[in-house]
């Protein structure tokens, strides 16, 4: 898929032109009937600069650009306020984050991006990455988050429903790339790879700070729109739900898991690792004790001493003072 430097081949220019036209007409459409095609979680009114249509995100009240995707932070805030053979699959690194904390009401900066430090109503604070996923242990108001760490690699792990046969990998690849290009307006260079090992599909999005130019859709925003589409909760105004088809065959997703990799690995303290380690040790010890107990019991059963011991122990127990 990789291509060397040089001009894009002629066939690529037409879709690019169509994409620019679509963006322009999308913007015009927003002016005409004062709605936001790319974000249904907005309220639009004709009181923007120059008396033009202005759409404000619910929750924050920030004006949004309806010709592109709205940032995930503003969408989350709006959601919280709204009236809810060869192995080709990538193994997520040990630093990969999964969004286990679920929904929260985030603090967004003036550009609509996540603030590096997030706090809840009870003054519990934590640091997040550029997609708003927690990347440190939770602390108090004294917790410092020096910078917003960029999520530069997103791995979208999908499992599709059983079909008559496997999808053709190159058809699937082309369809998913088209989807991210046309529906989410993500530049094709940011879709690094599409892996397929039936029934698992993995979409890799990569976007370093240096690669992201002004006006480029953020991979975190594209992934969030995709996730909501897959769940049947489209954020687009008036558009039907996502109808994914590969050569006419519907692609129905039954499970989604998204891994986020940051430019700087997350900083979870040893407590978290220790807790996991202790859990493993406890399980092993319990298993060993249980195994030994089973051996002792079977041995005693064979020698006929078991019942006697049990009665004796019960007798001793009865002697204990009742609390």
């Amino acid at each position: 898929m990789a291509r060397g430097p040089g001009l894009a081949p002629p066939p690529l220019r037409l879709p690019l032109l169509l994409l620019v036209l679509a963006a322009v007409t999308g913007h015009t459409a927003a002016q005409d009937n004062c709605t936001c095609p790319t974000n249904k979680m907005t309220v639009c009114s004709p009181d923007g600069p120059g008396g033009r249509c202005q759409c404000r995100a619910l929750g924050s009240g920030m004006a949004v650009d309806c010709s592109t995707l709205t940032s995930k932070c503003l969408l989350l805030k709006a959601r919280m306020s709204a009236p809810k053979n060869a192995r080709t699959l990538v193994r997520p690194s040990e630093h990969a984050l999964v969004d286990n904390d679920g929904l929260y009401d985030p603090d967004c900066d003036p550009e609509g991006r996540f603030k590096a430090r997030q706090c809840n109503q009870t003054s519990v604070c934590w640091c997040v990455n550029s997609v708003g996923v927690r990347r440190t242990d939770k602390g108090d108001l004294s917790l410092r988050c020096d910078e917003l760490v960029r999520t530069h690699h997103i791995l979208i792990d999908l499992r599709h429903r059983p079909t008559a046969g496997a999808f053709n990998h190159s058809d699937l690849d082309a369809e998913l790339r088209r989807l991210f290009r046309e529906r989410y307006r993500l530049h094709p260079k940011f879709v690094a790879a599409v892996h397929y090992e039936q029934p698992t599909i993995q979409i890799e999005l990569r976007q370093n700070t240096s690669q992201k130019a002004a006006g480029d859709v953020d991979i975190g925003d594209a992934a969030y729109y995709f996730e909501r589409d897959i769940k049947g909760e489209s954020l687009f105004q008036g558009r039907g739900g996502l109808d994914l088809r590969v050569r006419g065959e519907p692609l129905q997703v039954e499970r989604t898991l998204i891994y986020y990799l940051d430019e700087i690995p997350p900083k979870f303290s040893m407590k978290r690792l220790t807790a996991g380690l202790i859990a493993v040790i406890v399980v092993v010890v319990v298993a060993l004790v249980a195994g030994m107990a089973v051996l002792v019991i079977t041995n005693r059963r064979k020698s006929g001493k078991y019942k006697k011991v049990e009665i004796k122990e019960l007798g001793e127990l009865r002697k204990e003072p009742s609390l």
């Epitope: 309220v43 009114s45 009181d47 009240g61």
Partner: antibody, heavy 115, light 107 residues
């Protein structure tokens, strides 16, 4: 032309509630946010909150969340603000104002809370 | 919340002079600032919207400038009818906020 009509004054007892009205005319009521602003005598302007008549969405400044409730009646193009558990601190002039740029203002209702 | 700081609290000028009111935002708000005039016992009146856009019916001597965090309202030749309080207000994000106001006095 655009007009926002508010009653001139309201006198209520401490602890009671009051419902202030703002009747809009001369524009499409459901297309613009309606905001409410408080001004105590000799003081500055304070934003209370807003309501979008087209969908009933509301937002409040934190300090007014437990004090005011904004509603609309689209059939009569009227916005309302219900103020509860009134104290002397609530004595002020209350304005309704249209759109995000506050381009049109009502004359204001002077609320006096006194026993 | 976005804090708007207006300075000075009182401005005293002679008729015909040029006067400028300052408004500083606690964070970048682009051009989402509006200016209001409030005469004694009157309702506020919109003078300038989105930092520099003029309003029909407002005398041309009123103008606005600035973007980001620093904004200015200017009256290029003050008249006696301009005696009033002047407020800036931001509509960048909720909650909307006002500056504390500047009182214009005529010498």
């Amino acid at each position: 032309q655009v007009q926002l009509q508010q009653p001139g004054s309201e006198l209520v007892r401490p602890g009671a509630s009051v419902k202030l009205s703002c009747k809009a005319s001369g524009y499409t009521f459901t297309s613009y946010w309606m905001h409410w602003v408080k001004q105590r005598h000799g003081q500055g302007l304070e934003w209370i909150g807003n309501i979008y008549p087209g969908g009933g969405y509301t937002n409040y400044d934190e300090k007014f969340k437990s004090k005011g409730t904004l509603t609309v009646d689209t059939s009569s193009s009227t916005a309302y603000m219900h103020l509860s558990s009134l104290t002397s601190e609530d004595s002020a002039v209350y304005y309704c104002t249209r759109s995000s740029v506050f381009d049109y203002w009502g004359q204001g209702t002077t609320l006096t809370v006194s026993s | 919340d976005i804090l708007l700081t207006q300075s000075p609290a009182i401005l005293s000028v002679s008729p015909g002079e040029r006067v400028s009111f300052s408004c500083r935002a606690s964070q970048n708000i682009g051009t989402s600032i509006h200016w209001f005039q409030q005469r004694t016992n009157g309702s506020p009146r919109l003078l300038i919207k989105y930092a520099s856009e003029s309003i029909s019916g407002i005398p041309s001597r009123f103008s606005g400038s600035g973007s980001g965090t620093d904004f200015t309202l200017s009256i290029n030749s003050v008249e006696s009818e301009d005696i009033a309080d002047y407020y800036c207000q931001q509509s960048n994000s909720w909650p909307f906020t006002f500056g504390s106001g500047t009182k214009l006095e005529i010498k």
